[in-house]
Interface confidence: medium
């Protein structure tokens, strides 16, 4: 049984009756194939469900799909397959849902082999109605909405053409041929790579990076010898082949590719890769793969320009390009990230940073847990978190770690307690302070989700047997109650709740199996009557984030400021509500050397917080250069950590040194950049 499932727990009274009145079953009139679910808009209650069923015949595969729509968060569904003329929808393209609350949906249909182009069904009224449109091309990718204007769509064709629509897919225009990768930037800008000779694969490393800011009327070549590119926050990254060998190097632009600087990162060879782990408008976490098939690399964190990088974490687990990494942004507390390292003995250990990659430590051992067999010392060990890598290795881990920005401080994850990740069956752990302290929440693996901004946590046991019980907690996982939502157990396939954790509805998906047939079924439970009143001021308490030492005046200071939050008391059983806004009070901290990183040409000796000038850069180090605008080439040795808001206190001043002599770059010069028009 779960910790806290005892008589002393604070019980919610009469919850069985309250939940029974708010449990809605829907049996789908299909054979069991695959099912996909999408939420349309925010707080609209509209859900689209696409079920598909394949019958492999001797000559071809016959497919059938059905489309259902709910407008009450999944309590009732209506079959709307006739709105798409009973057409078979291609599941690999999914349902392309428009940004924000645009109400737009695009479904891509399966068409017969000889047709001139593909077919889509478009809705701009939250899937109440659909319009069929035949395309002048066969799509290779899902339609991509411009983040700024949901009427603007782009798609790549199977012939590598870049197609754009300005009227939500009604009319399409091919704006460029020979395109490998295309992405929307800001302000309706499109970035894409093109090949000149054979193909995307053959020209890898010889691609050109282009930009159009007017949906294809005019173009600008902003990079050559490109291997690939990526966008993160306000940064545009390109990996560029070196002139003299097969290595490549990251270049970065903060002005949409007009000017570039070489990132102070190691170059990589053909078998290695770069990966943007996380990026925002302040900085970027970059993984650089180690040479050889090691399965690990190094995490670097950038300055505010994306140019100067500090080594953040060695031996960072990342299996292969596009492979698995456990790197997780803990969205419930600023500055917190969790990931895994591959230690010298090939065991995998979890590390956490509370200051955006400045320092990494092991996770504190939960007080209510014993060290497992992986621990050398039974009294000293750490919590290790299962994430993407464990899931890819088919360990008994049904879900990755979970955190939500509006459920402040809460992190839920599968884990084991020892010296390294264990392959034994994991338990579920919870932190209520953003990862500083942990408690075992549930015994064994579970599916879990957060509702009502943390007011309710729901969990279902991960089992190969049919299930009919759901667990819920109203006190951040301390005490659990169980509710039998159906007499007839179902084979469970997934928990679904509206993204954003503001909803009070949870849908349990699964299928029933009888001797003759197998059918999809969903149960939607509304917890509104459990949380029967709205939260008031007295239900909240003040919490200082990142607090480790109350005696220290700088307690809670991370990246130059501290934040006090109003948090729901664990014993308060009430609704935060859909409109709940996290209340926080920031206060600025005094600057210390910890608030600065070392600028280009400077480094921190181990166990020293001062930045000292590197000896004259020689050989390989010459490639760690700044390129572009003149001001990049002057430094006072320190640079404020991106996002750091400290004021006063230590203000390191250095004589400005001209580092021009230390700088070379081989990337495209601005004067070589040419504009073209259609």
């Amino acid at each position: 049984s779960a910790p806290g499932e005892d008589e002393e727990c604070g019980r919610v009274r009469d919850f069985v009756a309250k939940l029974a009145n708010n449990t809605h079953q829907h049996v789908f009139d299909d054979l069991r194939g695959s099912v996909s679910l999408s939420w349309v808009g925010d707080s609209t209650g509209v859900i689209l469900v696409l079920t598909t069923f394949h019958v492999p015949l001797v000559i071809m595969t016959f497919g059938q799909s059905k489309l259902y729509r709910s407008e009450d968060y999944g309590k009732n569904f209506k079959d709307i397959t006739d709105l798409i003329n009973n057409t078979f929808i291609r599941t690999e393209f999914g349902m392309a849902i428009g940004p924000e609350n645009s109400g737009k949906v695009v479904l891509t249909a399966e068409v017969s082999g000889g047709s001139r182009g593909g077919r889509i069904f478009r809705s701009s009224d939250f899937a109440k109605n659909f319009v069929q449109t035949d395309l002048p091309f066969h799509p290779l990718t899902q339609m991509m909405y411009s983040p700024q204007n949901s009427d603007y769509l782009l798609a790549l064709s199977t012939e590598n053409g870049l197609w754009v629509s300005k009227n939500f897919g009604g009319k399409w225009e091919e704006i460029h041929k020979a395109v490998c990768l295309a992405k929307w930037g800001s302000d309706n800008t499109i970035f894409f790579t093109t090949y000149a000779n054979g193909s995307c694969k053959a020209d890898l490393g010889a691609l050109e990076l282009w930009r159009t800011s007017d949906l294809g009327k005019s173009f600008k070549t902003i990079g050559v010898k490109i291997y690939s590119f990526g966008l993160g926050g306000r940064f545009l990254f390109a990996s560029v082949m070196a002139d003299k060998d097969t290595t490549r190097r990251i270049h970065v632009s903060t002005d949409q590719g007009d000017t570039w600087s070489m990132a102070q990162l190691p170059s990589v060879g053909q078998e290695q890769f770069y990966s943007i782990l996380a990026a925002n408008d302040d900085m970027v976490f970059m993984h650089v793969d180690e040479p050889g098939d090691t399965g690990f690399g190094t995490i670097f964190t950038s300055d505010d320009r994306g140019i100067v990088y500090s080594k953040s974490l060695d031996r960072h687990l990342y299996t292969t390009t596009g492979g698995e990494t456990d790197f997780t942004n803990v969205t419930s507390l600023r500055g917190v990230y969790i990931t895994s390292v591959l230690s010298e003995d090939n065991s995998i250990q979890t590390m956490i940073t509370f200051d955006q990659g400045g320092r990494w430590t092991h996770l504190r051992k939960p007080e209510n847990s014993e060290c497992d067999a992986t621990a050398k010392n039974k009294n000293e060990c750490s919590l290790h978190i299962h994430a993407s890598y464990s899931i890819s290795q088919k360990l008994n881990v049904p879900m990755a770690p979970l955190s939500e920005p509006n459920a402040v401080g809460i992190v839920i994850a599968h884990g084991s307690v020892g010296d390294a990740i264990s392959v034994m069956v994991p338990d579920v752990y919870i932190s209520d302070d953003g990862g500083y302290s942990w408690t075992k929440m549930l015994e064994g693996p579970h599916y879990y989700t957060i509702l009502d901004s943390g007011g309710i946590i729901v969990a279902i046991e991960h089992s190969s047997r049919p299930i009919n019980v759901i667990k819920f907690s109203t006190d951040e996982g301390q005490c659990w109650q169980t509710y039998t939502f159906t007499r007839d157990p179902i084979y469970f396939t997934g928990l679904a709740s509206e993204p954003g954790a503001r909803s009070m509805n949870i849908s349990i998906w699964g299928f029933t199996e009888s001797a003759l047939t197998s059918q999809w079924v969903s149960y939607t439970i509304d917890f509104k009557d459990i949380l029967e009143r709205n939260c008031e001021e007295k239900d909240y308490t003040i919490w200082l984030a990142h607090s480790t030492d109350p005696e220290d005046y700088e307690d809670g200071c991370i990246l130059g400021y501290k934040e006090q939050f109003l948090r729901l008391r664990k014993s308060s059983v009430c609704q935060n509500g859909r409109d709940y806004v996290v209340t926080k009070q920031p206060s600025i901290c005094l600057c210390s050397l910890e608030d600065f990183l070392c600028d280009f040409g400077y480094y921190r000796p181990e166990n020293d917080s001062k930045c000292v000038e590197q000896p004259e850069l020689k050989g390989h180090d010459l490639e760690f250069c700044l390129y572009g605008r003149e001001e990049h080439l002057t430094t006072n040795g320190y640079r404020k950590i991106p996002g750091d808001k400290c004021q006063g206190g230590v203000n390191p001043v250095r004589e400005v040194k001209d580092l021009k002599k230390k700088c070379t770059s081989n990337f495209l010069s601005p004067e070589k950049q040419n504009s073209k028009s259609n």
Epitope: G10, S437, D475, P550, Y553, R569
Partner: antibody, heavy 124, light 107 residues
Framework: QVQLVQSGAEVKKPGASVKVSCKAS????????MHWVRQAPGQGLEWMGW????????RYAQKFQGRVTMTRDTSISTAYMELSRLRSDDTAVYYC?????????????????WGQGTTVTVSS | DIQMTQSPSSLSASVGDRVTITCRAS??????LNWYQQKPGKAPKLLIY???SLQSGVPSRFSGSGSGTDFTLTISSLQPEDFATYYC?????????FGGGTKVEIK
């Protein structure tokens, strides 16, 4: 060492006001809530409210709402509790007490340091 | 407001006795329950916080347990300096409330 030193005993007439001070030393004053608790002769303990010295935010027990004002002066690490419209049943020992903190939570962990108490007598 | 009910209101015991005081909350307060000791003419002293955590400097003969609504303070072997009044206090929901107290006297 950590201590709270309160002002001396007061004798007041009904309808008057009293202001009790509590000077903190030996710790970072703004990092801990300050609670005020009173105890009538021969009775139990009664919580009046708290002040967050960092922000000046307060929370008062409903019973004292409108009559109590809690303030602080961070420059001299002192908290104040003023009770107005005094009645005879306000005769009590008034304590200031520091709220214990744990991993960021300001409430929920009791009061770990107490002042020596200030006796307030309300009599006509 | 949450009512805190302490029992017994007084008890007589001898040095070396094991003493148990209970405290019941009118609704769940999770583990936000604290215990204090008060001697005549003195300010209260925090013994146990968060239901079971021993405040530093407090002898280990004092222990606390419970969560939700029912809590217990135990003195494993009563010492002469332990004769005092003991109060429980919930600090989970405003207003903070105290129990009525339990007076431990010498038998």
């Amino acid at each position: 060492q950590v201590q709270l030193v309160q002002s001396g005993a007061e004798v007041k007439k009904p309808g008057a006001s009293v202001k009790v001070s509590c000077k903190a030393s030996g710790y970072t004053f703004v990092a801990y809530y300050m609670h005020w608790v009173r105890q009538a002769p021969g009775q139990g303990l009664e919580w009046m409210g708290w002040i967050n010295p960092n922000s000046g935010a307060t929370r008062y027990a409903q019973k004292f709402q409108g009559r109590v004002t809690m303030t602080r002066d961070t420059s001299i690490s002192t908290a104040y509790m003023e009770l107005s419209r005094l009645r005879s049943d306000d005769t009590a020992v008034y304590y200031c007490a520091r709220g214990k903190r744990s991993s960021g939570w300001y409430e929920g962990y009791g009061m770990d340091v107490w002042g020596q108490g200030t006796t307030v007598t309300v009599s006509s | 407001d949450i009512q805190m009910t302490q029992s017994p209101s007084s008890l007589s015991a001898s040095v070396g006795d094991r003493v148990t005081i209970t405290c019941r909350a009118s609704q769940s307060i999770s583990s936000y329950l604290n215990w204090y000791q008060q001697k005549p003419g003195k300010a209260p002293k925090l013994l146990i916080y968060a239901a079971s955590s021993l405040q530093s400097g407090v002898p280990s003969r004092f222990s606390g347990s419970g969560s939700g609504t029912d809590f217990t303070l135990t003195i494993s072997s009563l010492q002469p300096e332990d004769f005092a009044t003991y109060y429980c206090q919930q600090s989970d929901v405003s207003p903070i409330t105290f129990g009525g107290g339990t007076k431990v006297e010498i038998k």
